[in-house]
């Protein structure tokens, strides 16, 4: 048994620097406690963007200073990353861990390439 995680290949951030995508996992068991982590991979470096642990049926709770928000529905997690700029363009990987009950399972998506285009500044009007 293994856990497969699916996420879209490409997503475009909107003009306000917000990008949303769905992270879906095929759970081999009935998990009650799940941890979702968004990772950013640039070159061979992987860094954590945000993480949330939630009980099935409850809302995801990210830390107060997190740039992520999300909702869960069954084996789907709807993730939104805010405050993105052009320099944040990159591959965002969804990692899911079934923390409880045993056994533990971990699954990692192939990543979503998020493209961010900084808006053009408005021209000065006389």
């Amino acid at each position: 048994k293994a856990m497969h995680v699916a996420q879209p290949a490409v997503v475009l951030a909107n003009s306000r620097g917000t990008a949303s995508f769905v992270c879906e996992y095929a759970s081999p068991g009935k998990a009650t406690e799940v941890r979702v982590t968004v990772l950013r991979q640039a070159d061979s470096q992987v860094t954590e963007v945000c993480a949330a642990t939630y009980m099935m049926g409850n809302e995801l709770t990210f830390l107060d200073d997190s740039i992520c928000t999300g909702t869960s529905s069954g084996n789907q997690v709807n993730l939104t990353i805010q405050g993105l700029r052009a320099m944040d363009t990159g591959l965002y990987i969804c990692k899911v861990e079934l923390m409880y009950p045993p056994p533990y399972y971990m699954g990692i998506g192939n990543g979503t390439q998020i493209y961010v285009i900084d808006p053009e500044p408005c021209p000065d009007s006389d």
Epitope: A2, P28, E33, L39, I93, M99, M106, G107, I108
Partner: antibody
Framework: QVQLVESGGGVVQPGRSLRLSCAAS????????MHWVRQAPGKGLEWVTF????????YYADSVKGRFTISRDNSKNTLYLQMNSLRAEDTAIYYC???????????WGQGTLVTVSS | EIVLTQSPGTLSLSPGERATLSCRAS???????LAWYQQKPGQAPRLLIY???SRATGIPDRFSGSGSGTDFTLTISRLEPEDFAVYYC?????????FGQGTKVEIK
């Protein structure tokens, strides 16, 4: 840089207890799950136990279940292994290891030797 | 529990030669959550390969991993003197985390 330093090993009699510590530095300890792995003299690697980010979820190998307890203090950046009812077959080098973002054990301590002998 | 069986137990080769190490799983290792570690005497294991084929940071490109499902391979294209060590495979997709029994690569 990432560093894991184990301590607390030594010689102990069968049936007695020992507590190992693993001091972590160079990374945000609370953001990583952790493991203990052991290696008996001249033998291979054996996974012992795992602990989640906040310490709420713990998993154990059948060989130590009910005797060993893993814990962590995120405020002190330290991982612990409480070993009770020690047996001769628990004699090994005990390593603490960090789970990397993508799952494998990316950093290991230098190990601490536990010898269970009368 | 996923049981990992490594072969051969010992590999006797000369520097410059190619080393091929095998790791077979008792059941499918999901999404290739398989790692390879190198361990030298008196040292802790060091991560070489994760995800079956991705090299860890700082690992030279003479080390490569391949395989999927139940059969995995670690290849060292040209053995350097510092490569003579014991190599372990490990699955990390589910508990309990398991290691193979190891393959010793020794100087012929």
């Amino acid at each position: 840089q990432v560093q894991l330093v184990e301590s607390g090993g030594g010689v102990v009699q069968p049936g007695r207890s020992l507590r190992l510590s693993c001091a972590a530095s160079g990374f945000t300890f609370s953001h990583y799950t952790m493991h203990w792995v052991r290696q008996a003299p001249g033998k291979g690697l054996e996974w012992v136990t795992f602990i989640s980010y906040d310490g709420n979820n713990k998993y154990y190998a059948d060989s130590v279940k009910g005797r060993f307890t893993i814990s962590r203090d995120n405020s002190k950046n330290t991982l612990y292994l409480q070993m009770n009812s020690l047996r001769a077959e628990d004699t090994a080098i005990y390593y603490c290891a960090r789970t990397g973002w993508l799952g494998p054990f990316d950093y290991w301590g230098q190990g601490t030797l536990v010898t269970v002998s009368s | 529990e996923i049981v990992l069986t490594q072969s051969p137990g010992t590999l006797s080769l000369s520097p410059g030669e190619r080393a091929t190490l095998s790791c077979r799983a008792s059941q499918e290792v999901g999404d290739s959550y398989l790692a390879w570690y190198q361990q030298k005497p008196g040292q802790a294991p060091r991560l070489l390969i994760y995800g079956a084929f991705s090299r860890a940071t700082g690992i030279p490109d003479r080390f490569s991993g391949s395989g999927s499902g139940t059969d995995f391979t670690l290849t060292i294209s040209r053995l350097e003197p510092e490569d003579f060590a014991v190599y372990y495979c490990q699955q990390y997709g589910s508990s309990p985390w398991t290691f193979g029994q190891g393959t010793k690569v020794e100087i012929k």
